[in-house]
């Protein structure tokens, strides 16, 4: 029975060229997290954090993605093409799979509002 809930940073915006933290948090469950997957809007994998093996950043994102903080992900050198949905998928035992959604809007530097709670200045 899946009792947990995923909390995310929700809808966030950040400056072109800047950085942003994507963060999900699983609560209200005793389940043990065995792996967290981070996917982009086109379902391409950015990174995986496996409990035993640690972080794996996919080659296409190696230069612009940094693991953490925690189970989150830091996106750097943002471009307008980074605008879109991001998904965290928590694989947990014995509950199964939890999924969270974040929408990132990358704005031209002159109009960006610092709306992200976890955003890096």
């Amino acid at each position: 029975m899946m009792t947990g809930t995923i909390e995310t940073t929700g809808n966030i915006s950040a400056k072109k060229g800047g950085s942003v933290i994507l963060q999900c948090h699983l609560s209200s469950t005793m389940a043990q997290v065995t792996q967290v997957n981070w996917e982009q809007h086109d379902h391409s994998l950015l990174a995986i954090r496996n409990a035993e093996l640690g972080w794996h950043i996919y080659p296409a994102f190696k230069d612009r993605v940094a693991p953490g903080p925690g189970l989150g992900l830091t996106l750097q050198s943002l471009t307008m093409n980074d605008t879109g949905e991001y998904f965290c998928t928590y694989h947990t035992y014995p509950d199964g799979t939890y999924r969270g959604r974040i929408f990132l809007e990358v704005l031209e530097s002159s109009v960006a509002e610092h709306s992200a709670r976890f955003q890096i200045p």
């Epitope: 043990q32 065995t34 199964g96």
Partner: antibody, heavy 121, light 106 residues
């Protein structure tokens, strides 16, 4: 080599308590949930529940609440099962089994060699 | 709770035979099913996960199939070391084991 080594057989009187240990080696103890499984003489396998090796939080399956306690000592990579107020029907082989995983799929591997607990007056 | 029913409960076969064990779930469990082999006095041995994925080191004569509510474990050509009890296990909604299938030499 990944392995689980359990403590030896126990002969106990009704009303007594027993503590079974399960020492893990060959892997990161806190990266994998640990389960306990009971097998009464001539019977099948019965999942007793599991313990989150990150948090120490135990979860008990139906029929295994009250007299059964799962615990950990992460400093020595060991899980414990304690049964109090033993009854004749607690006579069984008790196994610890690590949860293995790949993405959203889970299984039990490896298993400890089993500990026979005999309750007799 | 999801119940797993294995059939048959007892099976007599000869070396070289092809045998199939069925495991039925009381409700759909997708492919969240594992198979184990247990010999007398020994701990269970893990064989298959995700209904059909063979664990490394398990002989290729073992295979699993199915999804939803009906699953099978097939041994294509029985070897002497295969005579044992086999259990299915669902990992979709907490965990339960089937009652076991005892495979004996005819």
């Amino acid at each position: 080599e990944v392995q689980l080594v359990q403590s030896g057989s126990e002969l106990k009187k009704p009303g007594a308590s027993v503590k079974v240990s399960c020492k893990a080696s060959g892997y990161t103890f806190t990266s994998y949930p640990m389960n306990w499984v009971r097998q009464a003489p001539g019977q099948g396998l019965e999942w007793m529940g599991w313990i989150n090796t990150n948090t120490g939080n135990p979860t008990y399956a139906q029929g295994f609440t009250g007299r059964f306690v799962f615990s950990l000592d992460t400093s020595v990579s060991t899980a414990y099962l304690q049964i109090s107020s033993l009854k004749a029907e607690d006579t069984a082989v008790y196994y610890c089994a690590r949860t293995g995983y790949s993405g959203s799929y889970y299984w039990f591997d490896p298993w400890g060699q089993g500990t026979l607990v005999t309750v007799s007056s | 709770d999801i119940r797993l029913t294995q059939s048959p409960s007892f099976l007599s076969a000869s070396v070289g035979d092809r045998v199939t064990i069925t495991c039925r779930a009381s409700q759909g469990i997708s492919s969240y099913l594992a198979w184990y082999q247990q010999k007398p006095g020994k701990a269970p041995k893990f064989l298959i996960y995700a209904a059909s994925t063979l664990q490394s080191g398990v002989p290729s004569r073992f295979s699993g199939s199915g999804s939803g509510t009906e699953f099978t474990l097939t041994i294509s050509s029985l070897q002497p070391e295969d005579f044992a009890t086999y259990y299915c296990q669902q990992l979709n909604s907490y965990l339960t084991f089937g009652q076991g299938t005892r495979l004996e030499i005819k």
